[in-house]
């Protein structure tokens, strides 16, 4: 019964970009300005998203698709469909409630967004620090200390399993 009724529903013939107008005997009317319908058979059109303030228009609204926003320079998108704009920081910083703050010692951020993350602990993989970390860059791990010592055997035993716990680098 449901299938039969849907086949007879005149609204199902209304294409995207139109709506089924109950006030006009269920004929298909075009979406009014600043509205859209992305699928057929709609009884109303949706209001277009407006990209205002820190948002800027990436794609204009059309009768069949919503507008898409991104963020003005100095900000980046967060959330599905760029629902929020968040302030950029510099590399080597992270955004806090009090604004952009430098990464504290032992952490880095190589992007203008996101948080500072701890330097890799090379010793966990039995390796040594080849290049020290900075606020902007992670450490670079190199061979294990045993590999670097003169006259070291070419076959090194596996590093002993560290007891996970307090682990200064």
């Amino acid at each position: 019964f449901e299938r039969t009724r849907s086949l007879q529903d005149p609204c199902s013939n209304c294409p995207a970009g139109t709506f089924c107008d109950n006030n006009r005997n269920q004929i298909c009317s075009p979406c009014p300005p600043n509205s859209f319908s992305s699928a057929g058979g709609q009884r109303t059109c949706d209001i277009c998203r407006q990209c205002k303030g820190v948002f800027r228009t990436r794609k204009e609204c059309s009768s069949t698709s919503n507008a898409e926003c991104d963020c003005t320079p100095g900000f980046h998108c967060l959330g599905a469909g760029c629902s929020m704009c968040e302030q950029d920081c510099k590399q080597g910083q992270e955004l806090t409630k009090k604004g952009c703050k430098d990464c504290c010692f032992g952490t880095f951020n190589d992007q203008k967004r996101g948080i500072c993350r701890p330097w890799t602990n090379c010793s966990l993989d039995g390796k040594s620090v080849l290049v020290n970390g900075t606020k902007e860059r992670d450490v670079v791990c190199g061979p294990s200390p045993a590999d670097l010592s003169p006259g070291a055997s070419s076959v090194t035993p596996p590093a002993p399993a560290r007891e996970p716990g307090h682990s200064p680098q």
């Epitope: 948080i115 716990g165 680098q169």
Partner: nanobody, 116 residues
Framework: AVQLVESGGGLVQPGGSLRLSCAAS????????MGWYRQAPGKQRELVAM???????YYLDSVKGRFTISRDNAKIAMYLQMNSLKSEDTAVYYC??????????WGKGTQVTVSS
């Protein structure tokens, strides 16, 4: 002595979900950032997700949109909700509490296996 204990690991089918928890015992306070790392056999330990004291987060590209990290400061606890799991997520997952460069703590790990 401070100890971190992970729980919630196990065997799950591809597409399934798991929720990992990390709890601290011992005297610990003012944790700047909490993170989940993972290590698959023969691979380096990698940072999967991290949350700082302001609630800012970091996610490994391959888990974005699937994993969600959260923390409960009152309980000194951290969680990792893992959805749409894939075979490549199979690893030992370690929790990590970072107070400073000189003071940070690791859990012993919990095994996550994604297999049909």
């Amino acid at each position: 002595a401070v100890q971190l204990v992970e729980s919630g690991g196990g065997l799950v089918q591809p597409g399934g979900s798991l929720r990992l928890s990390c709890a601290a015992s011992g005297s610990i306070f003012s944790i700047d950032r909490m993170g989940w790392y993972r290590q698959a056999p023969g691979k380096q330990r990698e940072l999967v997700a991290m949350i700082n004291s302001s609630g800012g987060t970091y996610y490994l590209d391959s888990v974005k949109g699937r994993f969600t990290i959260s923390r409960d400061n009152a309980k000194i606890a951290m969680y990792l909700q893992m959805n749409s799991l894939k075979s490549e997520d199979t690893a030992v997952y370690y929790c990590h509490y970072w107070i400073s460069h000189e003071m940070n703590y690791w859990g012993k790990g919990t095994q996550v296996t994604v297999s049909s």
